[in-house]
Interface confidence: medium
């Protein structure tokens, strides 16, 4: 019968011929009367056999990631008779892995959106690297993830690649962050190979800013001939939030005379001061009103940012009109 051990050949061997092992028949008494032959894919080109001894050699550099095993057939023939000594046998040469592939992030570019002011521990995104080396061969394909850029705002779970928030962020200070993640094989041991990826993390807005008047005092004038409904001027607040979170409503907080009103132009986010009832210079030639501004939409959990509405004072001077 045939005698052999399992055959392994390390990938990426640089020698011109590398001894893998020996195939022999137990009938072979070593007097060179048998001839060994190798058949199948790779026979003669990648692998050769010493016809007399049955020693098998790899004569080409192999890449496990390209092909991890070769199935070949062996024959042994009695030289004198030309007849097979053993039935033809199939055997396997396995290409053993070395750590010659760095981890690669296949799904890049990575981009994630997370609300500003999210608490510590909030999941942002999971990044995953692949390593073409053999996962069953030592630690060649066992990866550890680490953060090269992004502290102190982000952290990465070493074994899963899950990125989490580690410190609250304010969109109004910085609205996006580039995080660089490294994946290292060999679980970080010497000889490890690494790959990196960038993750763009954008902060979405939450309503954590209240509108604030641009001026603490506005001065407007109104002619005593102005009819009710006249727009006598505009006031404006600014809000560091964006979109819906910056929509605001203006209103009168204080007007003892009940002479004025304020309506909101929702396109420009301005407050328009309107004459509610006619004024008479001889009766009263200036007015003081206080206006306030609030956001249109404030979720309950964000009310803490909106406790005191911003206010402004408006001085309104009545212009005299000569009466007939």
């Amino acid at each position: 019968g045939w005698v052999w051990n399992q055959f392994f050949v390390p990938e990426e061997m640089n020698t011109t011929s590398h001894h893998i092992g020996q195939l022999r028949s137990d009938l072979d008494n070593g007097n060179n009367s048998f001839q060994y032959k190798l058949l199948g894919a790779g026979a003669g080109s990648t692998f050769i056999i010493d016809e007399r001894t049955g020693d098998i050699y790899a004569i080409q550099k192999l890449d496990r990631e390209e092909r991890s095993l070769y199935i070949l057939r062996a024959q042994v023939i009695d030289i004198a008779t030309g007849r097979a000594v053993e039935p033809e046998s199939e055997f396997v040469i396995k290409v053993s892995d070395i750590n010659d592939n760095e981890p690669k992030f296949l799904d890049e570019p990575y981009e994630a959106i997370v609300p500003e002011m999210s608490p510590e521990g909030t999941l942002v995104i999971q990044v995953t690297a692949s390593d073409a080396d053999d996962p069953s061969s030592g630690n060649n394909a066992r990866l550890l993830y680490s953060l090269l850029q992004g502290q102190p705002y982000f952290s990465v779970e070493p074994t899963t690649g899950v990125i989490r928030i580690s410190s609250k962020m304010d969109r109004e200070l910085q609205d996006e962050y580039w995080v660089i993640i490294q994946a290292k094989d060999m679980i970080g041991q010497p000889g490890a190979l690494s790959g990196t990826t960038s993750v763009l993390i954008k902060l979405s807005d939450v309503n954590d800013n209240k509108p604030i008047f641009k001026e603490s005092l506005y001065r407007l004038t109104v002619s005593e001939s102005a009819p009710t409904g006249t727009s006598i001027g505009t006031i404006m607040a600014y809000d560091n939030d964006i979109g819906e979170n910056a929509e605001m409503d203006y209103s009168i907080e204080e007007d003892d005379s009940q002479t004025f009103d304020i309506i909101t132009n929702h396109e420009t986010q301005e407050g328009i001061v309107i004459l509610k009832k006619k004024v008479d210079f001889e009766h009263q030639n200036h007015y003081g009103i206080r206006a306030k501004v609030k956001n249109h939409h404030v979720p309950e959990q964000l009310m803490k940012y909106h406790t005191e509405a911003s206010t402004t004072f408006i001085k309104i001077q009545v212009e005299d009109v000569d009466e007939p």
């Epitope: 603490s216 003892d256 001889e282 007015y287 003081g288």
Partner: antibody, heavy 119, light 107 residues
């Protein structure tokens, strides 16, 4: 410190002219509306004129309208009152006063300058 | 114009006594538009009260203002020697007018 200092008062004949100045310091002059208020000897206070922070609007008491002109130079932090066609009844101590941002009452006054109109 | 009438013209009191000064308007004045000033001899007026009842910065709490409509009051709860002066009310809703003043003198 925060203060207003008037100057330019003196004795003038009826029909004459005088220009009063008020130098402001210690606060942002260009942000405040400013007024002149006068006080005849032994009498009460009488408002004279107001000018808005940027000079865009000016208003006068009926008793001085057409004769007095209020103006300001924000680059020099100075308020002025040009008084023409002076009358005996214009004799008074003239105060410059700062209006508060939130109303028309006066939270800062100068020490006053005396104008005497006499023949 | 709105005329302000102060009474009494003179109030003779001793230190430690309570002073009550009245200011009456010829027509209704919003309480938001009434102020009180103190003027010591040879000095400029000094703001005490605005908006009828709000004390100006640095004014001791013995000074208080009240009233609405046409009747307003300045109260000095316990007179100090430096409180003997002339007091003016001012309305600033329709132009600017002052009362004729109340003199608080030492009895």
């Amino acid at each position: 410190q925060v203060q207003l200092v008037e100057s330019g008062g003196g004795v003038v004949q009826p029909g004459g002219s005088l220009r009063l100045s008020c130098a402001a310091s210690g606060f942002s002059f260009s942000s405040y509306d400013m007024d002149w208020v006068r006080q005849a000897p032994g009498k009460g206070l009488e408002w004279v004129a107001v000018i808005w922070y940027d000079g865009s609007n000016k208003y006068y008491a009926d008793s001085v309208r057409g004769r007095f002109t209020i103006s300001r130079d924000n680059s020099k932090n100075t308020l002025f009152l040009q008084m023409n066609s002076l009358r005996v009844e214009d004799t008074a101590v003239y105060y410059c006063a700062r209006e508060t941002g939130e109303g028309w009452y006066f939270d800062l006054w100068g020490q006053g300058t005396l104008v005497t109109v006499s023949s | 114009e709105i005329v302000l009438t102060q009474s009494p013209g003179t109030l003779s009191l001793s230190p430690g006594e309570r002073a009550t000064l009245s200011c009456r308007a010829s027509q209704s004045v919003s309480s938001s538009y009434l102020a009180w000033y103190q003027q010591r001899p040879g000095q400029a007026p000094r703001l005490l009260i605005y908006g009828a009842s709000s004390r100006a910065t640095g004014i001791p709490d013995r000074f208080s203002g009240s009233g609405s409509g046409t009747d307003f009051t300045l109260t000095i709860s316990s007179l100090e020697p430096e409180d003997f002066a002339v007091y003016y009310c001012q309305q600033y809703g329709s132009s600017w007018t002052f009362g004729q003043g109340t003199k608080v003198e030492i009895k």
